[in-house]
């Protein structure tokens, strides 16, 4: 396993509507054709997984139908926007690359984003 | 690079007010306020956007209140009815809008605003 640098933006402020979009770009030091990223989320120590995707270089990226996690990826850049977050979800999120193929594999982690969520004053009663 | 200036702080009794000032050496889609205590977390305390729309934590609300002067690339924090529990490090932040959301890529130096009771 061979380490690799992983930046990611210190700060973010989540959109009104709960939705957190960033940019997590990784030093490549290879020709990777097929890489892994996982957003984790550090809260009190623990470490939890959010959401993962692997995708084949200049494809989409693929998460799973429930997962509140989207991307794209361009180069060696991958846009992440991370949805439905609520005050509650405000934390230090973690972008973590592997590159799984071909051989050598390679593993970076950022210093993580903290995404502040704030949530919307709810909207007063209405008779229309 | 954006180089931001605060200034404006000191300490002050409770219930006074204190007014936060940061130069922004150009023009940024987000800016926002965090402030941080000692032995705290940072903490945001109010953004606003090109909309422009504004956001205050739960704790300032109604005795905070964040403005920007777009042709001086200058944003405000007008702070009244002070608290004790506002006492921290008041750090501008500043970075571009990307799909809705605000990345506070740069960051000033800070000021500190001390509340005595």
């Known amino acids: 396993c061979k380490a690799m640098h992983v930046a990611q933006p210190a700060v973010v402020l989540a959109s009104s509507r709960g939705i957190a979009s960033f940019v997590c770009e990784y030093a490549s030091p290879g020709k990777a054709t097929e890489v892994r990223v996982t957003v984790l989320r550090q809260a009190d120590s623990q470490v939890t997984e959010v959401c993962a995707a692997t995708y084949m270089m200049g494809n989409e990226l693929t998460f799973l139908d429930d997962s509140i996690c989207t991307g794209t990826s361009s180069g060696n850049q991958v846009n992440l926007t991370i949805q439905g977050l609520r005050a509650m979800d405000t934390g230090l999120y973690i972008c973590k690359v592997e590159l799984m193929y071909p051989p050598p594999y390679y593993l970076g982690i950022g210093n993580g984003t903290q995404i502040y969520v704030i949530d919307p004053e709810p909207c007063p009663d209405s008779d229309f | 690079q954006v180089q931001l200036q605060e200034s404006g702080g000191g300490s002050v009794q409770a219930g006074g007010s204190l007014r936060l000032s940061c130069a922004a050496s150009k023009y940024t889609s987000c800016m926002g306020w965090f402030r941080q205590a000692p032995g705290k977390e940072r903490e945001v305390v109010a953004h606003i956007d090109s909309g422009p729309r504004t956001l205050y934590a739960d704790s300032v609300k109604g005795r905070f209140t964040i403005s920007k002067d777009n042709a001086k690339n200058t944003l405000y924090l007008e702070m009244s009815t002070l608290k004790p529990d506002d006492t921290a490090m008041y750090y501008c932040?500043?970075?571009?809008?990307?799909?809705?959301?605000?990345?506070?890529?740069?960051w000033g130096q800070g000021t500190q605003v001390t509340v005595s009771s």
């Open positions: 932040a500043a970075g571009p809008m990307y799909s809705g959301s605000c990345n506070y890529n740069y």
